[in-house]
């Protein structure tokens, strides 16, 4: 369930505008069990931010992280 009390995180909103790329150190995808697909970016301050995987900037950041 997307609302279960386990440690499977799910996102219910997406960040509206891009984060500075330099602030992001890693990312992960949320589970397919979640009601909304999401990419979670982790910042250098260990903050976790939900992003829409369909957005161009999100895909570009993922590609950049994969290459670094």
């Amino acid at each position: 369930s997307p609302y279960s009390s386990d440690t499977t995180p799910c996102c219910f909103a997406y960040i509206a505008r891009p984060l500075p790329r330099a602030h992001i150190k890693e990312y992960f995808y949320t589970s397919g069990k979640c009601s909304n697909p999401a990419v979670v970016f982790v910042t250098r301050k260990n903050r976790q931010v939900c992003a829409n995987p369909e957005k161009k900037w999100v895909r570009e950041y993922i590609n950049s992280l994969e290459m670094s």
Partner: nanobody, 124 residues
Framework: EVQLVESGGGLVQAGGSLRLSCAAS????????IGWFRQVPGKERKGVSC????????YYEDSVKGRFTISSDNAKNTIYLQMNSLKPEDTAVYYC?????????????????WGQGTQVTVSS
């Protein structure tokens, strides 16, 4: 075991007040922001408010600003949502939620733990 237990919901007339509580256990309180989401039948849960346990930073959704106040009692690992000037459109099930580590990007932060929810009904 992680637990978030809400209480304080109920039926109230428009213009009235309620105070919701969320008692947290089973995880390090300072590592999470605790927030409130609400859900009406057939719609997605929406983030209403959030407080960072570590520094007290808060977030309020626009429709509740000036009416709702979130606070924490770290000694009791409990978060409160004081809801004043309630409107019929505030009617929903209110859920307590835990998201790491603070409210900077709330509600665009992943939710790791949920409470069971408490019903708030505002009659006109």
């Amino acid at each position: 075991e992680v637990q978030l237990v809400e209480s304080g919901g109920g039926l109230v007339q428009a213009g009235g007040s309620l105070r919701l509580s969320c008692a947290a256990s089973g995880f390090t309180f300072d590592d999470y922001a605790i927030g409130w989401f609400r859900q009406v039948p057939g719609k997605e849960r929406k983030g209403v408010s959030c407080i960072s346990s570590s520094d007290g930073t808060t977030y309020y959704e626009d429709s509740v600003k000036g009416r709702f106040t979130i606070s924490s009692d770290n000694a009791k690992n409990t978060i409160y949502l004081q809801m004043n000037s309630l409107k019929p459109e505030d009617t929903a099930v209110y859920y307590c939620a835990a998201a790491p580590p603070d409210c900077t990007y709330y509600p665009a932060t992943p939710i790791y733990y949920w409470g069971q929810g408490t019903q708030v009904t505002v009659s006109s």
